[in-house]
């Protein structure tokens, strides 16, 4: 078969596995006269064998390892043995066969890492070699962790990355590795190869033994720092260090404070810089950070707990200019007249803040001195002595010493003497007849006017009056509000009236006054008042069971859903017709009778959720009355929206020619909802062409960087297609265009001739 | 550093169907588009078209429109191009090549023989 | 589709010779051409890209240039291992096409 397996001397390539015993023949050379013979050299390793009559083969099997390429040259000769055609090169390429399993470089390994390493962040590597063809699966290398010892829970503290042989810390390994509890672990590393997805693959093991060592960045106890420190400032109340010098150490106010008292130097010493005020902020609570030369972090901050410690630096303060009290002139010794209550801005429930009272001071001393008593902790007033006569003292003064530990502070306090209350009120009617009043009457209406006397002293608490009503309103919907001088009672209403539930009530009023009545007299009949109060139908709009409806669906929902109902009732039984009010985009339908919401068109969340409509139930029959609610629908996103860029990418460009290559920065987002993460979009050329020319890089989830690969650009516009694929379920791709200009600059501007200013670009890079 | 490993030779059938692979390795597989070459003696070098991985997105020749069909599985970083309908005149030899085409497979040698 | 026309078809020269190979386009393809060498075994490498941007790794006697429509690569010094094909790839616009190849021959 010419061609194939025979033919003439010429340059030829040959592929043969390693490790087959020959089978046939690699070539037949055919001579040209006057060549009659052929003779082989070059690395033929006593293997490849050229007959004279130009049979070319070998005679035992290859081995890749040992030679993966065997060079060889045939020469033609004449009958006198002299080269008439060649030496031409024939190459023998020595196909792999996985013969070789992978070893360890080491068979035991030893690492450390520390407490609370970042997860996924390598601190050691186990390397394994293959004499086979790394370009085949045969050397292509699978690393695997086989064991953990110990094993706590079941739960892997390290992994492995398959490819690479790096050994990290999991989530798991990073937050629970703890050396106090352990500390030290032993892994067991396979190796296979064959990519590890053959069973015929080959492997190895290797034991690694790692210390686990201690993480020192930790947070520091919290911190108590007395305030208004008079010592010079700043002062060192605490320190955090990293574990390896070199850290810059800074600290973040998550509070965005407008004074932050505290500062960190490169030691990782936290310094108070000014004096604190507890009554300003008594608790800061800010972080300290840890990061490399190139301003990266090196660990998650730490949170720093300072609590500033009280001083008595505050006196105590009275609640008012003057506290009035008023006091019955027959009270009776040990009566309460009123309680002081003095305040100190100095911490609750310390001796900073414990306030003591005492009298020091009555006016006048008639019929005597110490008429008074006040409680030394609970400042609350008694009557000390005989009881008071009005005609004799009205009023007396009383000064007042109120102290914490160190500070002391007068208050004043004014004591009304009053007539005893010894009058009940009296109603000037028992029975206020009968109202009657349709159920939408307003609510604030004044319905009723009713009216007592009191004969004590007037304008105090014995002589004022005070309304309750005590009978046949449990729904409170009435109320009594009174005026202070005429003591005259408005009786309002407060809720709704209702003829369904409550058609007739019958009202009891008491009267009664805010001071107590003197010992042996009671309120009798004459405080009482009745009334009955009659409520008449009208004919009422249905009532929705909730003022606002909300459902929630996904944005893809089929035309024809059930996305909600609604539900009303008439108050007089009637019979309820549903209807729809604002649904400007038409994507919902209401069944009338069940009130049940339908989606009749596709929904879309970008176009605003929640969707919000009214719903209208109206009676049917009768006066045909109706109501609102509203429905809010919120639309959960589905992935309905492609990437696209965030702004208009318009005026970017280049000054030509490029004296280097450059890059520009790009932002694109999408419609979508991105929850948490946000975006996690993914870049790459809109086709391979453009790949000669451009390169896009990912910066992160919503930016990209768009270089040249080169200088060599023509002076135009190039449009550059980029494909930004969301990642989404399902994936969207959106293929965008950024235009990038390659002009002469002028001042590190595009140059435009005259009369050639159109689109002028306006971004230089 | 990157390679294109591609399968071994075939010899097919007329009528029947095959797919070549190409596996990538030493770079982000998903970002670059791998292209797919044709090259038979006498006719030289063809584009056959392009894939992205990372999105399946694909443009092709028209000319090869219904004969090449282009995947990708990410998992195994691996380009596939089926070809259907077999004929003698695909015989050929079919390379791969990432966008920009500074790195080739060693190509995959396809014969078409009854 | 654009045509890459590509002369001459084979070129003898002797190591050491200057040599120039040309490619001409029927349509304005701006610089998006690249020069591909392939060696005898079918192993297929970049020598040039964006017409005259020389891959790394490539020796320096390999150069690209254009003029109009024709691109040029030139060999300023022949060594013994250039005496392979060569072809022209056009980027401008799809499909992507080729020259037809050049190969050059020891004299």
């Known amino acids: 078969q010419e061609g194939k397996f025979s033919g003439p001397l010429k340059p030829m390539t040959f592929s043969i596995y390693e490790g087959q015993e020959p089978s046939q023949i690699i070539f037949q050379f055919k001579a040209n006269p006057p060549a009659v013979t052929f003779e082989l050299t070059g690395e033929t390793d006593n293997i490849f064998v050229i007959e004279r009559e130009g049979l070319l083969y070998y005679n035992r099997a290859l081995d890749r390892e040992t030679r993966s390429t065997h060079n060889l040259q045939v020469a033609a000769l004449d009958a006198n043995g002299i080269i008439v055609e060649g030496p031409v090169p024939i190459t023998i390429k020595v196909k792999d066969i996985n013969d070789n399993r992978p070893t360890f470089l080491q068979s035991k390994y030893e690492g450390s890492v520390r407490q609370n390493s970042r997860p996924g962040k390598p601190f050691l590597y186990v390397n394994a070699t293959d004499l086979d063809d790394p370009a085949t699966p045969n050397g292509q290398l699978y690393y695997q962790i086989v064991i953990q010892l110990p094993m706590i829970n079941n739960v892997m503290y390290f992994q492995i990355n398959n490819k690479t042989g790096a050994i990290s810390l999991t989530r798991e390994g990073s937050q629970e590795l703890n050396p106090a509890k352990n500390p030290s672990y032993n892994l067991v590393i396979s190796v296979k190869d064959m990519g590890g997805q053959s069973e015929n693959s080959f492997s190895d093991t290797t034991s690694v033994d790692i210390i686990v060592t201690e993480n020192i960045w930790k947070a520091p106890k919290p911190v108590e720092m007395v305030e208004n420190s008079t010592d010079p400032h700043p002062i060192k109340i605490t320190q955090v260090r990293w574990n390896d010098p070199g850290a810059q150490y800074s600290l973040v106010d998550k509070e965005k404070l407008p004074r932050f008292p505290f500062s960190i130097d490169q030691e990782g010493d936290i310094y108070v810089t000014q004096p604190l005020d507890r009554e300003e902020k008594d608790a800061y609570v800010f972080y300290a950070v840890a990061k490399d030369e190139y301003g990266k972090p090196l660990s998650y901050p730490l949170e720093i707990h300072v609590k500033v410690k009280d001083i008595n630096d505050n006196p105590p303060t009275c609640p008012s200019p003057v506290t009035v009290f008023e006091v019955q002139e027959n009270e009776r010794l040990g009566n309460s007249i009123g309680t002081l209550t003095a305040h100190d801005r100095d911490e609750e429930n310390t001796a900073n803040s414990f306030l003591n009272y005492r009298i020091v001071e009555q006016t006048p001393k008639l019929p005597m001195d110490g008429l008074f008593l006040i409680q030394t902790y609970a400042g609350m007033l008694q009557l000390a002595k005989q009881s008071l006569k009005k005609q004799d003292t009205p009023q007396y003064n009383l000064t007042i010493e109120v102290s914490d530990k160190d500070f002391k502070t007068l208050c004043f306090v004014q004591i009304n003497v009053i007539d005893i209350n010894d009058q009940i009120p009296i109603f000037e009617k028992s029975d206020y007849g009968n109202l009657t009043l349709a159920e939408d009457t307003n609510i604030g209406s004044t319905i009723l006017t009713i009216q007592a006397t009191d004969a004590d002293e007037p304008f105090t608490g014995s002589s004022k009056i005070l309304y309750h009503i005590i009978k046949g309103d449990s729904e409170g919907r009435l109320g009594v509000d009174t005026d202070p001088h005429t003591n005259t009672g408005y009786v309002i209403i407060k809720k709704p009236l209702d003829f369904e539930t409550a058609a007739v009530s019958n009202i009891v009023f008491k009267a009664e006054n805010p001071e107590p009545l003197v010992f042996g007299v009671k309120y009798n009949a004459s405080s009482f008042a009745k009334f009955t109060l009659i409520v008449t139908d009208v004919n009422e709009a249905p009532q929705f069971s909730q003022h606002v409806f909300q459902a929630k669906v996904s944005e893809d929902v089929a035309i024809g859903t059930k996305v909600g109902n609604v539900t009303a009732k008439d108050p007089e039984g009637l019979d309820i017709s549903y209807s729809l009010r604002g649904d400007t985009r038409g994507w919902l339908k209401i069944d009338h009778v069940t009130g049940e919401i339908f989606s009749v068109a596709p929904l879309d969340r970008e176009a605003g959720s929640p969707y919000r409509v009214q719903v209208v139930a109206t009676e049917v029959g009768g006066s045909s009355l109706s109501s609102v609610s509203e429905f809010h629908l919120i639309l959960m996103d589905v992935n309905d929206n492609p990437p696209r860029l965030a702004k208009d990418y318009t005026g970017l460009f280049f000054c030509h020619p490029l004296s280097a290559p450059g890059s520009l920065i790009f932002e694109a987002t999408d419609d979508d909802q991105h929850l948490f993460r946000g975006p996690h979009f993914t870049f790459s050329l809109g086709s391979g062409s453009l790949q000669n020319d451009w390169e896009v890089s990912k910066i992160n989830g919503t930016h990209a960087r768009l270089s040249t690969r080169h200088t060599e650009f023509e002076e135009r516009e190039y449009v550059v297609l980029i494909r930004i694929n969301d990642g989404g379920r399902p994936p969207l791709e959106g293929i965008v265009s950024l235009p990038v200009t390659f002009c002469s600059c002028v001042e590190g501007s595009c140059f435009r001739p005259a009369g050639h200013q159109t689109g002028i670009p306006t971004v230089g890079m | 550093q990157v390679q294109l490993q591609q399968s071994g030779a075939e010899l097919m059938k007329p009528g029947a169907s095959v797919k070549l692979s190409c596996k990538a390795t030493?770079?982000?597989?998903?970002?670059?588009?791998i292209e797919w070459i044709k090259q038979r003696p006498g006719h030289g070098l063809e584009w056959i078209g392009e894939?992205?991985?990372?999105?399946?997105?694909?443009n092709y020749n028209e000319k090869f429109k219904g004969k090449a069909t282009f995947t990708a599985d990410t998992s195994s970083n691996t380009a596939y191009m089926e070809l259907s309908s077999l004929t003698t005149e695909d015989s050929a030899i079919y390379y791969c090549?990432?966008?920009?085409?500074?790195?080739w497979g060693q190509g995959t040698t396809l014969t078409v023989s009854s | 589709d654009i045509q890459m026309t590509q002369s001459p078809s084979s070129l003898s020269a002797s190591l050491g010779e200057r040599v120039s190979l040309t490619c001409r386009a029927s349509?304005?393809?701006?610089?998006?051409v690249n020069w591909l060498q392939q060696e005898p075994d079918g192993t297929i490498k970049r020598l040039i890209y964006?017409?005259?941007s020389l891959e790394s790794g490539v020796p320096k006697r390999f150069s690209g240039s254009r003029s109009g429509s024709d691109y040029f690569l030139t060999i300023s010094s022949l060594e013994s291992e250039d005496f392979v094909d060569y072809y022209c790839?056009?980027?401008?616009?799809?499909?992507?096409?080729f020259g037809a190849g050049t190969k050059l021959e020891l004299k």
């Open positions: 090549a990432r966008a920009g085409y500074n790195n």
């Open positions: 030493g770079y982000t597989f998903t970002g670059y588009w």
């Open positions: 894939i992205l991985p990372g999105s399946g997105s694909t």
């Open positions: 349509q304005d393809i701006g610089r998006s």
């Open positions: 964006a017409t005259s």
């Open positions: 790839l056009q980027y401008a616009s799809s499909p992507l096409t």
